[in-house]
């Protein structure tokens, strides 16, 4: 009996530009002889319903139809027909099919590959055209994919050390698509510093599918109006 097993859940998520390994494990009742078996990987894009060959391995020959695509002969011996794709791009997301032939048997499995890009975040202070004691703080998130993103603002005071979400005077602009397919967005917070306590910490909080934990950038309001300082930012998708 010949069986193929793909990633549990049927979906794999990978960061943009990563060297991704798309899993495909072979289960066979006898030891595998790689010289008498075949592996073919196919890809179907999200936009076109046409399947194309990515890689094939037959006995003493292998061929990559996508530059750098490879199945390890050394891993194949122990039943691992996973496909390595170096430098994965956004447009390579879609359905991947692993087809295994151990004559006369054939088995196959499919998996959805999602490619994500983590946002970079930075805080800017814009005082141009602002009234006295009024400041506009901008939180720029750039280079993310997919488009869906959530940006919120929080503040912590010495009286209330737990973060409180700010809903007033927040404007989040439209997402802008970059040439490489990633997106940018800016969220603005308008503050009247005369009405705020010195020592108040403000945070821009970015939540995105590519991030395990939100990306936080903060600044502290000082007696001298403001002190803009970006704390450690975590871009930790893995």
């Amino acid at each position: 009996d010949l069986k193929v097993e793909m990633m549990a859940g049927g979906t794999q998520i990978t960061p943009l530009n990563d060297n991704v390994t798309i899993f495909c494990n072979i289960f066979y009742s006898q030891p595998l002889n790689i010289t008498s078996m075949g592996i073919t990987w196919f890809w179907k894009s999200l936009t076109f319903d046409k399947e194309v060959k990515v890689f094939e391995f037959f006995g003493d020959h292998q061929e990559a139809f996508r530059p750098g695509a490879i199945v390890s002969p050394w891993r194949l011996k122990s039943g691992d027909a996973s496909l390595r794709l170096p430098g994965i791009q956004l447009e390579e997301a879609g359905e991947y099919r692993c087809e295994v032939v151990v004559t006369p048997l054939k088995a196959q499995g499919t998996v959805q590959l999602e490619v994500v890009a983590s946002p970079a975040s930075r805080l800017l202070l814009d005082q141009v055209g602002m009234k006295e004691n009024e400041d506009k703080y901008m939180c720029e998130s750039s280079g993310f994919y997919p488009e869906a993103i959530n940006i919120t603002w929080e503040k912590q005071t010495q009286k209330f050390p737990h973060p409180i979400e700010i809903s007033e005077d927040v404007i989040t602009g439209p997402t802008i698509k970059n040439m490489d397919g990633t997106f940018n967005v800016t969220s603005c917070l308008k503050l009247n510093s005369s009405q705020e306590d010195p020592g108040t910490v403000y945070q821009c909080v970015v939540r995105h599918a590519s991030l395990h934990t939100p990306l936080r950038s903060n600044f502290t309001l000082t007696a001298a109006r403001h002190s803009l300082s970006e704390t450690e930012k975590t871009d930790n998708f893995s």
Partner: antibody, heavy 120, light 111 residues
Framework: EVQLVQSGAEVKKPGASVKVSCKAS????????MDWVRQAPGQGLEWMGD????????LYNQKFRGRVTMTVDTSISTAYMELSRLRSDDTAVYYC?????????????WGQGTTVTVSS | DIVLTQSPDSLAVSLGERATINCKAS??????????MNWYQQKPGQPPKLLIY???TLHSGIPDRFSGSGSGTDFTLTISSLQAEDVAVYYC?????????FGQGTKLEIK
């Protein structure tokens, strides 16, 4: 920085088993296989087998089949090699080595070695 | 199993001179246009260190005085200008077939 840190020296009696560990750091553990190679005193190198951390699949040198068991714990990036029914000629330094498997096959980083002495 | 035979067993070369070690395989270690032959250096009390893989590719961080050549069954490791720190035992290894096998080693000394 890639590092493979092996467990300490062992002294065993004939017939016993030994389990050597190899803790990996500085790279994605599942992207490479782990080879196990041994070297008897004053002798050359002998490949014992390898394990694929991606699926736990193993390939053993026929010489050791039935006596060797290779396992991994991916949650702590650690590989293990257990050799049973030890004999005096199993006295050797046992090495784990990270093995590239996609673009050729070679052991590019090695552990410091674990000395196993089998003596009654 | 593929048997690898290194020659010579030991070699003494003067500092600055060329050192050549040969490795002969009992059958071809070529597959799909590549040669699966690797070379390692081992100094006393240390683990082996990768020098060359795929017959001729220099591993990162290895000085370019080391080079590898050959295909099929005959391979050569060359040190163009011997340095004192090159004193070691050198092993060839094939990775085309299991079990992966090593040569018996060549001990390189300074004359």
């Amino acid at each position: 920085e890639v590092q493979l840190v092996q467990s300490g020296a062992e002294v065993k009696k004939p017939g016993a088993s030994v389990k050597v560990s190899c803790k990996a750091s500085g790279y994605t553990f599942t992207d490479y296989n782990m080879d196990w190679v041994r070297q008897a005193p004053g002798q050359g190198l002998e490949w014992m087998g390898d394990i694929n951390p991606n699926n736990g699949g193993t390939l053993y040198n026929q010489k050791f089949r039935g006596r060797v068991t290779m396992t991994v714990d991916t949650s702590i990036s650690t590989a293990y090699m257990e050799l049973s029914r030890l004999r005096s000629d199993d006295t050797a330094v046992y090495y784990c080595a990270r093995s590239e498997v996609f673009y050729g096959n070679y052991a590019d980083y090695w552990g410091q070695g674990t000395t196993v002495t089998v003596s009654s | 199993d593929i048997v690898l035979t290194q020659s010579p067993d030991s070699l003494a070369v003067s500092l600055g001179e060329r050192a050549t070690i040969n490795c002969k395989a009992s059958q071809s270690v070529d597959y799909d246009g590549d040669s699966y032959m690797n070379w390692y250096q081992q100094k006393p009390g240390q683990p082996p260190k990768l020098l060359i893989y795929a017959a001729s590719t220099l591993h990162s961080g290895i000085p370019d005085r080391f080079s590898g050549s050959g295909s099929g069954t005959d391979f050569t490791l060359t040190i163009s200008s011997l340095q004192a720190e090159d004193v070691a035992v050198y092993y060839c290894q094939q990775s085309k077939e299991d079990p992966r096998t090593f040569g018996q080693g060549t001990k390189l000394e300074i004359k």
